[in-house]
Structure formats: structure tokens, C-alpha cells
């Protein structure tokens, strides 16, 4: 199935050009998306091209600037947030990145009523997190690991927590492992729907072992970065959840929410918090052995001035074939009765589907079903449930938006997006206004991305928000590669793959093959999305065939495929890449003497193991920031899939699945090992150990480190990295420079 037809015709051939590496590194063919910043059922904010903050009213068709670019520029603001009462705007500047989601910044409060910045009781700097209450203009913020509350922006702050301490106690923000592997946010505080209560997490990292690495900087002596980072089997953070009444914060102070007894009996995690009403909250907990999750609905007891979580409101989700959930345990979406909810979890056939839970999980009503998966519940209104799935035409790498009418019986299902722009758009997400009066659809491909605005009742398209016209024009004279998404059936396993083919691809010729792999549990690489990236260039200019394969362990195709890797990472992911390569060779257009594999992070681990598989299939390969032993990676992630590195659990496979154990097998391949020295995520230690094992085995290899770079290898390092990898591959494939 050719998803992106080549626009090459003989008459035009001389005007068309191939992609260059420079195009990729300059981001020449990057696309834009438009996500409205909804502020009501029919209004949204958007930052215009000239940096004015503009309010749009869909129903009146009017728009006006609420904040000028001059005001933004006066404090060098890069971001903003309007208070729900529309009286104030916070302006964010001095952005300083910490980890994946976290950053610190300076905040200024601008009073829209008088057109001046709020003076007196200004906010301290730098702030770790700041947010408005959902109603009015209360402010909660985290400064030096403690939480503060302001009733109004100009008021003095009320300090909620006092025990915050760098690298020890985190209040309202996650520590490293919770940020990266559990919450996937920079915050760990949650306002109740009307701002009466503020819930927050406290993470105690006092007993967690610390990872330390050098940051070279420009000084005479390098700095040492210390991060409490629990590796597999190590001591984990201790989490507690508190809720404070923000109207009377000093009355009884923060009240701890009790942990369900079956969870508290051993090591556990807090996984998410969902407010239901101002006086009902839902917490999700997870055992350290992550196959048991408990959803606990707690009610505010005015007579106790605290939170009651009766056993009758505890719902257990357990997996007998793998871990609980997909990548994360799904979160509930509550219905209007404020007690029943919709949630995605595995059905009896092992496919993740939407279920409606009214009293017990055992009595859950299945809302969707089939040999496909429901992926996200966007919104539940009184009469509709909007969700995404990969049901349409049985392509797991697509995403369409569906509406189920829950107001009528039996519920009827409608695909909102399936036939909108069928060739161009097969991978959608959505953003809904209050009560789903309107929504934006963002299409990511396979054609050029487009964002559109729709009526929430009729699904009618109202207007195009962003169609990337400039990109479309810029690509008119570019020879883009062709892309196919197809599947291989091997031993009762379906291996979906994406193949990126040179523009003048000829099946009768032989091409070098590059496998790009990620392959991590619950990931998906074969997606119907638009991209002009490094591999597009390699196909367009350098004439390579690039393939991405979703093997066992990958997501959205049922639990059999997903949980196949449970407790044995590094086995089937590698096997399936190898199997796919053999099938590609059988197709007749691959030069079997010129096959390479590359991957980043988990993909670096898989590519390393594939190169060291002893099959003789691969001539060369690249591992960027690879994991080399699961004992070196984060507890929350690793143990989810591998269990514990203890003798009575899974230590044997931890030891068997290292890259170092296969050092000898690198002798007959060209290996390029790359890592940033300041990688807080997959520590440089991983590559240092690979290098040591290769040296000890007297195996030649190539390596590149990036000083002071983290897991993303950003900035100038990106350019250097892709240039370096291009040279390596061209040399491997005997392509002239």
C-alpha cells in the first residue's frame, strides 16, 4: 500500500531534487500543528505568528488580542497562562530545562484589568511549577521543593509544605523516576474541579541510591551531577498523597489520603490522581511487582475533615499474563453520576478495550470489542463518548476518532475521522472544548499534517486551523521516498513493517537495507504518520531502503504480542527484527551484503543485540545511548517488564540479556557506539560497560561520545551525530561521498 505516492514525472524530473542532510538538520520540512488552548465551550486562545495572544470566539466569529507581543517581549516571555476568571495572565520566562518534562522558570503576573504587572508579593525565582486554580485566580506553585498557595496573585503566599529539600523530599513535583517512568509530567499536584482542594504528592528519596556523573562545563574542575535514581532492585521513593482545603488551608492542614491495605502491605507506587468532584477523588496505586493495580475512590468527610477511601470503592486490576496496563495503567474517565467510570483494560480475548464500571470491575460492561485496541478516551459527555482506536481497515498503526452515543440504547458507534481525508489522514488526535461543544482534529499523516475545527454536535468541519501550505509548496520539487505499510505473517505472529523506498525504486535492482529499530515494550514504530527526517534523506538521496518492524512486545495488537516479552527482554524483539530481515531478503530487492541496523535508547539495545546475534545478516550497525544491562536502568520501567534482579525472581535473565555478555559476537560486524556523557536517563555507564567488554574481548569498534549531552543529544550535537552516522553508513554500504 503506497501511502505517499511519488510525484515524479519524466517532464518534471530535471526540476526535482533529492532531500539533503542539510534539509533535515535545518528542519526545512518540519510541519506545524494547531492545538487550541480552550478556555470555554466556544473560546480558545492561540499565540499568533507575531506572538500576540489572541482569543477566538467560534460562535461570534470574533477574535481579539488579550495580550500584546509588546507585553510578552517586556519580560522575554516564552509561554503564558490565563487565569480562569480572565483577570490575570502569568508570563513564563528564563526557561531552564531539567529532565524530560521538568524545567524551572521565572513567572510574572500581568493584571488584564489595569494593564500592569502585579507589584508586591512577587513570585520567587526560579519556580519549579506554577498553575492557576480551575476557577477564579488562586495560584499554586512549587519553589525549592515546597508548595505555596496564593488566594490572589497580589496576596502574600501561604506555605503548605515545609519539609522540601533538594534531592531528598519533593512536594508537588516528581522526583526523577516518577517524572520519567510513572507520571510523565513535571507536576505532582492537582486542583479539584472548582478549586476547593489541592491534592499533592510527596516523594521521599532519602534512601535512594544516587547516580553521579561529571558535567564538564567550562570550569577548571567538572561539576558532579547527583540524582537519586533507583535502578532495578534498588530502594524506591516513598510516596504519600495529601489534600489541603485551599479555602481554609490553616484549619486542619494537609490531610493524608490512606493507601489501600492490599497495596500498603509491600513496596508500591502511586500512579495517578483524578478528581471526580470537589469532594470525591480517585487515586491509582500499583504494587512494585507491577501486575496489580488498585483504583481507590475517596470521599471528603466533612465531619473528619479528611478523606475516606472505603474498601467498597476499591477496584482491582490484575494481569495474569504480563504487567498491569499498557505502558502505563490507564486512567478512568468518570461519568456524570460521579461514581461510575469508563476505563481501558484488557478484555477476555486479550485486547485493550473500553469498559464501563458501575460497581465492581467483575461486573464491568464492555463498550468496545474486536481484534483491535481502543487507545485513548478523549471525553465523556452526557450523551457521547469520544475515543481513538486502530480498528479501521485493520491497520494497527492508524488512529481514528470515534463517537459512541451513550445516551441512547443500544449505544451506536460512528467513526468521526475515517472518511474525512482518507488518503491524507489516517492518524489523528483530538482536543475538546468544555462539554465537547467543539473539537480540533489534528491529523499527523500519512500526508501533510492538517488541523481542523469541528462542531461537537454534528461533527461538521468549521474551518481549517493549519494546513501547512508552505510545507506543501516547499515539497513540490522534492523527490520524496515512497512509503509502504504492510505485514508479514510468521509462525502465527503478525509483523507489521514500514518500508521507505528510494524515489525511483525498481524492484529488479538491489538496494542496501537499514533497519531502524526501537522495539521497547508497548511502543509502536509502524505508524501512518508524515515525517521528513534522516531516514527520508537516506532513501531519497543515498538510495537506501529503510525498514521499521513492530515485533513482539510492541503495542496495540493485543496482549499476546505485547506480553510475549514479559520477563525476557532482549530475546523476541531481536528475533523478530532478524526474521523480518530474512523476509525482506526474500523479496529480492535487498543487497544481502549491505544490511545495517540502528537504534536509539531501547533501540540501541536491540540493535546491539541484533548485531551480536551471530546470524551474519548485518554488516554494520549503530547504537545511540543504548541500555546495556537491565541492572543499570530505572526500577519502575525495568521491573515492570523484567521483575526483580534477585535469585528467587529473575536475576538469571538480567544477566543473560546484557550486551556485554555477547561482546565476542561483535567481532564480525562494524559497530558504532554513541552516548552523551550527561545522560540522566540511560547512563553513560551503559556504553562504558559495552566499551570495556569489547576492549577486554579485543574486539575493534567505533565510538563517539557527546560531552555534557543528555539522552536527546540536542543542539549542535544533533548535527554532528547525524553527519557522523551518515558517514559511517555510507562507508559501510560503500556509497561515494
Amino acid at each position: 500500500i503506497v501511502l505517499r505516492p511519488s510525484r515524479v514525472h519524466n517532464s518534471e524530473e530535471n526540476t526535482m531534487r533529492a532531500l539533503t542532510l542539510k534539509d533535515i538538520l535545518n528542519g526545512t520540512f518540519s510541519y506545524k500543528t494547531f492545538f487550541p488552548n480552550w478556555i470555554s465551550g466556544q473560546e480558545y486562545l492561540h499565540q499568533s505568528a507575531d506572538n500576540n495572544i489572541v482569543l477566538y470566539n467560534i460562535e461570534t466569529g470574533q477574535s481579539y488580542t488579550i495580550l500584546s507581543n509588546r507585553t510578552m517581549k517586556s519580560v522575554n516571555a516564552s509561554n503564558y497562562g490565563l487565569s480562569p476568571d480572565r483577570q490575570f495572565v502569568y508570563l513564563e520566562s528564563d526557561y531552564s530545562k531539567l529532565w524530560r518534562y521538568s524545567y524551572t522558570a521565572t513567572y510574572y503576573i500581568y493584571d488584564l484589568s489595569n494593564g500592569e504587572f502585579v507589584r508586591g508579593n512577587e513570585l520567587p525565582r526560579p519556580i519549579q511549577y506554577l498553575c492557576w486554580s480551575p476557577v477564579g485566580s488562586k495560584l499554586a506553585y512549587v519553589y525549592q521543593n515546597n508548595i505555596y498557595l496564593k488566594q490572589r496573585p497580589g496576596d502574600p503566599p501561604f506555605q503548605i509544605t515545609f519539609n522540601g529539600r533538594e534531592n531528598k523530599i519533593f512536594n508537588g513535583i516528581p522526583d526523577w523516576v516518577y517524572e520519567e517512568e510513572m507520571l510523565a509530567t513535571k507536576y505532582a499536584l492537582w486542583w479539584s474541579p472548582n478549586g476547593k482542594f489541592l491534592a499533592y504528592a510527596e516523594f521521599n528519596d532519602t534512601d535512594i541510591p544516587v547516580i553521579a556523573y561529571s558535567y564538564y562545563g567550562d570550569e577548571q574542575y567538572p561539576r558532579t551531577i547527583n540524582i537519586p535514581y533507583p535502578k532495578a532492585g534498588a530502594k524506591n521513593p516513598v510516596v504519600r498523597i495529601f489534600i489541603i482545603d485551599t479555602t481554609y488551608p490553616a484549619y486542619v492542614g494537609p490531610q493524608e489520603v490512606p493507601v489501600p491495605a492490599m497495596i500498603a502491605s509491600s513496596d508500591y507506587y502511586f500512579s495517578w490522581l483524578t478528581w471526580v468532584t470537589d469532594e470525591r477523588v480517585c487515586l491509582q496505586w500499583l504494587k512494585r511487582v507491577q501486575n496489580v493495580s488498585v483504583l481507590s475512590i475517596c470521599d471528603f468527610r466533612e465531619d473528619w475533615q479528611t478523606w475516606d477511601c472505603p474498601k467498597t470503592q476499591e477496584h482491582i486490576e490484575e494481569s495474569r499474563t504480563g504487567w498491569a496496563g499498557g505502558f502505563f495503567v490507564s486512567t478512568p474517565v468518570f461519568s456524570y453520576d460521579a461514581i461510575s467510570y469508563y476505563k481501558i483494560f484488557s478484555d477476555k480475548d486479550g485486547y485493550k478495550h473500553i469498559h464501563y464500571i458501575k460497581d465492581t470491575v467483575e461486573n464491568a460492561i464492555q463498550i468496545t470489542s474486536g481484534k483491535w485496541e481502543a487507545i485513548n478516551i478523549f471525553r465523556v459527555t452526557q450523551d457521547s463518548l469520544f475515543y481513538s482506536s486502530n480498528e479501521f481497515e485493520e491497520y494497527p498503526g492508524r488512529r481514528n476518532i470515534y463517537r459512541i452515543s451513550i445516551g441512547s440504547y443500544p449505544p451506536s458507534k460512528k467513526c468521526v475521522t475515517c472518511h474525512l481525508r482518507k488518503e491524507r489522514c489516517q492518524y489523528y488526535t483530538a482536543s475538546f472544548s468544555d462539554y465537547a461543544k467543539y473539537y480540533a482534529l489534528v491529523c499527523y499523516g500519512p500526508g501533510i499534517p492538517i488541523s481542523t475545527l469541528h462542531d461537537g454536535r454534528t461533527d461538521q468541519e468549521i474551518k481549517i486551523l493549519e494546513e501547512n501550505k508552505e510545507l506543501e509548496n516547499a515539497l513540490k520539487n522534492i523527490q520524496l521516498p515512497k512509503e509502504e505499510i504492510k505485514k508479514l505473517e510468521v509462525d502465527e505472529i503478525t509483523l507489521w513493517y514500514k518500508m521507505i523506498l528510494p524515489p525511483q525504486f525498481d524492484r529488479s535492482k538491489k538496494y542496501p537495507l537499514l533497519i531502524q529499530v526501537y522495539g521497547g515494550p508497548c511502543s509502536q514504530s509502524v505508524r501512518s504518520v508524515f515525517a521528513v527526517n534522516w531516514i527520508s534523506y537516506l532513501a531519497s538521496k543515498e538510495g537506501m531502503v529503510i525498514a521499521l518492524v513492530d515485533g513482539r512486545g510492541t503495542a496495540f495488537q493485543g496482549d499476546k504480542l505485547l506480553y510475549a516479552v514479559y520477563r525476557k527482554l532482549g530475546v523476541y524483539e531481536v528475533e523478530d527484527q532478524i526474521t523480518a530481515v530474512r523476509k525482506f531478503i526474500e523479496m529480492g530487492f535487498i543487497d544481502e551484503k549491505r544490511i545495517a541496523i540502528w537504534g536509539w535508547s531501547y533501540g540501541g539495545y536491540v540493535s546491539s543485540l541484533a548485531l551480536a546475534s551471530g546470524t551474519g545478516l548485518f554488516k554494520c550497525g549503530i547504537a545511540v545511548a543504548p541500555v546495556s544491562s537491565w541492572e543499570y536502568y530505572a526500577s519502575v520501567y525495568t521491573e515492570r517488564f523484567m521483575g526483580l534482579p534477585t535469585k528467587d525472581d529473575n536475576l538469571e535473565h538480567y544477566k543473560n540479556s546484557t550486551v556485554m555478555a555477547r561482546a565476542e559476537y561483535f567481532r564480525n560486524v562494524d559497530y558504532l557506539l554513541i552516548h552523551g556523557t550527561a545522560d540522566d536517563n540511560v547512563h553513560f555507564q551503559n556504553s562504558a560497560q559495552i566499551a570495556k567488554a569489547l576492549v577486554n574481548a579485543q574486539v575493534d569498534f567505533q565510538a563517539m561520545w557527546y560531552s555534557d549531552q543528555n539522552h536527546g543529544l540536542s543542539g549542535l550535537s544533533t548535527n554532528h551525530l547525524y553527519t557522523h552516522m551518515t558517514h559511517f553508513l555510507k562507508q559501510c554500504f560503500s556509497l561515494s561521498d
Epitope: Y251, P258, V259, E302, D303, W304, Q305, T306
Partner: antibody
Framework: QVQLVQSGAEVKKPGASVKVSCKAS????????IHWVRQAPGQGLEWMGW????????KYAQKLQGRVTMTTDTSTSTAYMELRSLRSDDTAVYYC?????????????WGQGTLVTVSS | EIVLTQSPGTLSLSPGERATLSCRAS??????????MHWYQQKPGQAPRLLIY???NLESGIPDRFSGSGSGTDFTLTISRLEPEDFAVYYC?????????FGQGTKLEIK
């Protein structure tokens, strides 16, 4: 010091209504729940319900739902309990009691009680 | 609703003796944090007086000869050495669930 002072005894006919008052002093009235508890002659204690003067939240005992109304007047720090459609088995001493701040459901200060007699 | 059963109905003891009063709940009144059981004393013609809150906490101004214990469904009020003024009716009360309920009372009388 904390005090709850209730209105005087009442004699009512069956079918009538009674409204008992409870004036609070010595603490911030809006912060604590006020409970109403009654005790029939020679019997035990029966919880009737509560009202939170600060939030306006009210909870009634199921068996009295529809007949009882609890209100407060924060300007005078007074709580009221009205019981309608009186029957002879409503004859009892009616107490207001303050909810202990962090005692989570214990009643730390009580009014002196108001005897309501329902008799034809 | 949670039913509280107090025993004995009447307890006859002499001053200086130790009194043990029991209260059993029809279901647990405890959570992981607290036991929501309280004890009151009532003398004839007077309003009840709080003695013990949350199963074991002594209310301020109450002599320390009074103590409370228990969790789950079984609770005990103990008076270590009876004084003449301790002879009265004692009630347990739960606030674990609405409606709040009281036990029927234990009458402590002079032997």
C-alpha cells in the same frame, strides 16, 4: 470558653412543628459542624443530623428526612433545628453539640438540652 | 447502618475498683489511619460529656484514670480506679459511617 446555649422547653400538639435554637460562643462558629442529637425519656442517644455553618453542608438521618430542617445564622452564631409533623414519639430532650475540630466525629461540647413534649 | 452493642447493660462496682466497659460494632469502624469510636459519660439531667475520641485519645480535662482501646469492631473503655463521681451511664458512638450511631448505654452503678 466554648458554650452552646439552647432555647427553652416546648410543649407541642401532634402534627405541629417545633424550632429549637442553639447559640454558640467562644469559638469561630463557621469552622465547626453542629450536630443535633435527641434522647427520648429513659432511652439512649439518637443522632439526627448535622449542619456545617461555614460550607452550608447538611446531612440528615434517613428516618427524619423530609421532617427535619437544620439552618444556621452566622451573623448571630446560632444554629436552628426545626422538626415538623410532630408525633408523640418525638417527645425527647434535643441537644445541639459541637463537632470536635480534629476529633473526626466526636462531639466535644454540648448544649444543655431542650425538652420538647408532644402531647394532645 | 452500623449497630453498636454495649455490654454489660449494667455494671455494679465499688469505688476504687477497675471498670471495663465493652462496645462491639456490627462492622469495622477503623481505617488504616483511625478508629472512629468515641466514648461519652452522661449523668442524670445532664448533657453527655466526651471522654475519649478516636478510640484511645483522652479529651482534655478528663482524668487519666479513663482510657480507651480497641480497633476494628471491638472497643473497651477502662476506668482504672473508680471515683464516686464516675457512676453514670456510658455511651459509645461511631463516626465511621453515616448515620452516626450510639450504643444503648452501660449503666455503671455503685455496688
Amino acid at each position: 470558653q466554648v458554650q452552646l446555649v439552647q432555647s427553652g422547653a416546648e410543649v407541642k400538639k401532634p402534627g405541629a412543628s417545633v424550632k429549637v435554637s442553639c447559640k454558640a460562643s467562644g469559638y469561630t462558629f463557621t469552622e465547626n459542624i453542629i450536630h443535633w442529637v435527641r434522647q427520648a425519656p429513659g432511652q439512649g442517644l439518637e443522632w439526627m443530623g448535622w449542619i456545617h455553618p461555614g460550607s452550608g453542608s447538611i446531612k440528615y438521618a434517613q428516618k427524619l428526612q423530609g421532617r427535619v430542617t437544620m439552618t444556621t445564622d452566622t451573623s448571630t452564631s446560632t444554629a436552628y433545628m426545626e422538626l415538623r409533623s410532630l408525633r408523640s414519639d418525638d417527645t425527647a430532650v434535643y441537644y445541639c453539640a459541637r463537632h470536635g475540630g480534629t476529633a473526626r466525629g466526636a462531639m466535644d461540647y454540648w448544649g444543655q438540652g431542650t425538652l420538647v413534649t408532644v402531647s394532645s | 447502618e452500623i449497630v453498636l452493642t454495649q455490654s454489660p447493660g449494667t455494671l455494679s462496682l465499688s469505688p476504687g475498683e477497675r471498670a471495663t466497659l465493652s462496645c462491639r460494632a456490627s462492622q469495622s469502624v477503623s481505617t488504616s489511619a483511625y478508629s472512629y469510636m468515641h466514648w461519652y459519660q452522661q449523668k442524670p439531667g445532664q448533657a453527655p460529656r466526651l471522654l475519649i475520641y478516636l478510640a484511645s485519645n483522652l479529651e482534655s480535662g478528663i482524668p487519666d484514670r479513663f482510657s480507651g482501646s480497641g480497633s476494628g469492631t471491638d472497643f473497651t473503655l477502662t476506668i482504672s480506679r473508680l471515683e464516686p463521681e464516675d457512676f453514670a451511664v456510658y455511651y459509645c458512638q461511631q463516626s465511621r459511617e453515616l448515620p452516626y450511631t450510639f450504643g444503648q448505654g452501660t449503666k455503671l452503678e455503685i455496688k
